[in-house]
């Protein structure tokens, strides 16, 4: 059997750091047994077997001119093996940090912090930890270890399906290379970690007879289970083309009747989630959806209380009296509190 | 000789922007992450961001989240600061800084002061 | 964020004392704790990296010990180019963080 050690990588590769002392171990002789070292297609004998050092050619202060192929000889002048050299680093702890899109599962990436030069894997695990008793601040024994699963294909990213939402767990991404492993834990809530996807399916609609309204509408992105009790609120933002500033609005539900829209130009729209109770962070932007408001015909029936906004063209104070706002019901909310210089407008 | 340096400092008006550059030589650039580290006058140091060797995680300070970010070009071994939206407690001595292991800030620059007056 | 705490703010010592700094930080942060040295006008320059170990060209009157919380740094016999701000800095998490600093002026 062979003398040298088989470091994690591939077959017939030894590995050394620069600037350091490295050791080379003739694979196909018996410990201690002496041999002679050459660099490949050179004659120069770069150790003898007289060295003391047996199996062994050490290169003091390796440098990148040290890379490269070695041969190692018996004393019958017999083939022990080659070797390649190849310098690089121990790893440093990677980079990590993780995201989840829903409250059941969260995928986890890792970036190097440092490139090693060497080839490198990534083990990836977690626990689940547990707090003891209501009052407690102590945590038990984790449980686990369980394998986070990496992706195919080499990208570095694993995903823990099946997650607790009011659980705290400890990912574990250890780095490993032909000279070492290094470790970086981080904690993770899925509380804090929750991002939704963007909302889907924006659209933005005039009304008719209305120049100064748009309704917007979306739905749950497609990644969020569809259970009662963990629900998503929205914001949303709309701005005339041109104009820099936008506009924002918490809707109650998947729709949102803009009242203040500038009549006869283009706005742009678009909506944000988060979940219901504030846990995590809100979302990206979905992409701008476009509409502009109708040139505005007077609809053919009026709702009887908008006979109340008679009031001169200005807009009604902040406590104003305003119609109940219905939270998730599908039908249109054609008039609202915003209503009244846009309705004196319609009706004159 | 291994060494990074700064520069784009200067004065700005609160509000206003500012880039600045750190030149690497002497090593290996893209094998390393990069870090800013800034002083305000007569203050203590205060981690700003850091980015990792590729370029895909990034990492900032709360003081500064979403107003600065923090990019590299590996190709002229340059490390990069889009300050915007200035404030005047930016005012500080920015250093550019190489880390091993994500924190361990082993090589600065001189560093390049910014002033966040009007 | 981890919180780091350095003890005393300033001193004043004779040439050739013994001087320790103390740094304590909000949580357990292994060993993964720094020192730094800063002269006015300069940059920082790294000691001691990991808790105790000396980075290469460092005098060896410098050294530091501690894990966990609870870090000490010491200067064996302090010279006059020791005149400096003395920072600790953690790296457990990704969001490093320095103490306040420590001046330390002779006698």
């Known amino acids: 059997s062979s003398p040298c050690p088989q470091a994690w990588g591939p077959p017939g590769v030894q590995y050394g750091q620069p600037g350091r002392s490295v050791k080379l171990c003739c694979p196909g002789v018996t410990a201690g047994d002496p041999v002679s070292w050459f660099r490949d297609g050179e004659p120069k004998l770069l150790q003898g077997p007289d060295s003391g050092l047996g199996h062994e050619l050490v290169l003091a202060q390796a440098d990148s001119t040290d890379e490269g192929t070695y041969i190692c000889q018996t004393l019958d002048g017999a083939l022990g093996g080659t070797v390649t050299l190849q310098l690089g680093y121990p790893p440093a702890r990677p980079v990590v940090s993780c995201q989840a899109a829903d409250y059941e599962n969260f995928s986890c990436t890792w970036s190097p912090s440092q490139i090693s030069g060497l080839p490198t894997r990534y083990l990836t695990s977690y626990r689940k930890k547990t707090v003891l008793g209501a009052d407690s601040q102590r945590r038990s024994p984790s449980t686990g270890p369980w394998p986070c699963p990496q992706d195919p294909l080499g990208a570095a990213r694993c995903v823990v399906h099946g997650a607790e939402f009011w659980s705290q767990y400890r990912i574990n991404v250890t780095e490993v290379n032909p000279l070492g492993a290094s470790t970086r834990l981080l904690d993770v809530s899925l509380q804090s970690i929750l991002r939704p996807d963007p909302p889907q399916g924006l659209r933005v609609e005039s009304v008719p007879g209305y120049p100064r309204r748009l309704r917007a509408s979306w739905t749950y992105p497609a990644s969020w289970p569809c259970q009662p009790h963990f629900l998503l609120k929205f914001r949303l933002q709309y701005r005339p083309a041109q104009h820099p500033a936008w506009s924002t609005v918490e809707p109650a539900g998947l729709e949102e009747v803009i009242t203040d829209a500038v009549a006869g130009l283009p706005h742009a729209v678009r909506v944000s989630a988060r979940d219901f109770l504030d846990a995590g962070t809100w979302s990206t932007w979905s992409p701008e959806a476009w509409g502009t408001p109708s040139t505005g015909t007077i609809p053919k029936e009026i709702p009887a209380w908008g006979q109340l906004h008679t009031q001169p063209e200005v807009e009604p104070q902040v406590d104003s009296p305003a119609p109940p706002r219905p939270s998730l019901q599908p039908h249109p909310r054609l008039l609202d509190h915003r209503d009244s210089v846009e309705q004196v407008a319609v009706l004159a | 000789e291994v060494q990074l340096l700064e520069s784009g400092g200067g004065l700005v008006q609160p509000g206003g922007s500012l880039r600045l550059s750190c030149a690497a030589s002497?090593?290996?650039?893209?094998?390393?992450?990069m870090t800013w580290v800034r002083q305000a006058p007569g203050k203590g140091l205060e981690w700003v961001s850091s980015i990792v060797p590729s370029g895909g995680h990034t990492q900032y300070a709360d003081s500064v989240k979403g107003r600065f970010t923090i990019s590299r070009d590996n190709s002229k071994n340059t490390l990069y600061l889009q300050m915007n939206s200035l404030r005047a407690e930016d005012t500080a001595v920015y250093y550019c800084?190489?880390?091993?292991?994500?924190?361990?800030?082993?090589?600065w620059g001189r560093g390049t002061l910014v002033t966040v007056s009007s | 964020d981890i919180q780091m705490t350095q003890s005393p703010s300033s001193l004043s010592a004779s040439v050739g004392d013994r001087v320790t700094i103390t740094c304590q930080a909000s949580?357990?942060?292994?060993?993964?704790l720094n020192w730094y040295q800063q002269k006015p006008g300069k940059a920082p320059k790294l000691l001691i990296y990991?808790?105790?170990n000396l980075q290469t060209g460092v005098p060896s009157r410098f050294s530091g010990s501690g894990s966990g919380t609870d870090f000490t740094f010491t200067i064996s016999s302090l010279q006059p180019e020791d005149i400096a701000t003395y920072y600790c800095q953690q790296y457990d998490n990704l969001s490093p963080t320095f103490g306040p600093g420590t001046k330390v002026d002779i006698k």
């Open positions: 990991d808790a105790s």
């Open positions: 949580q357990d942060i292994n060993n993964y």
């Open positions: 002497g090593f290996t650039f893209s094998w390393y992450s």
């Open positions: 800084a190489k880390p091993h292991d994500w924190g361990l800030f082993d090589l």
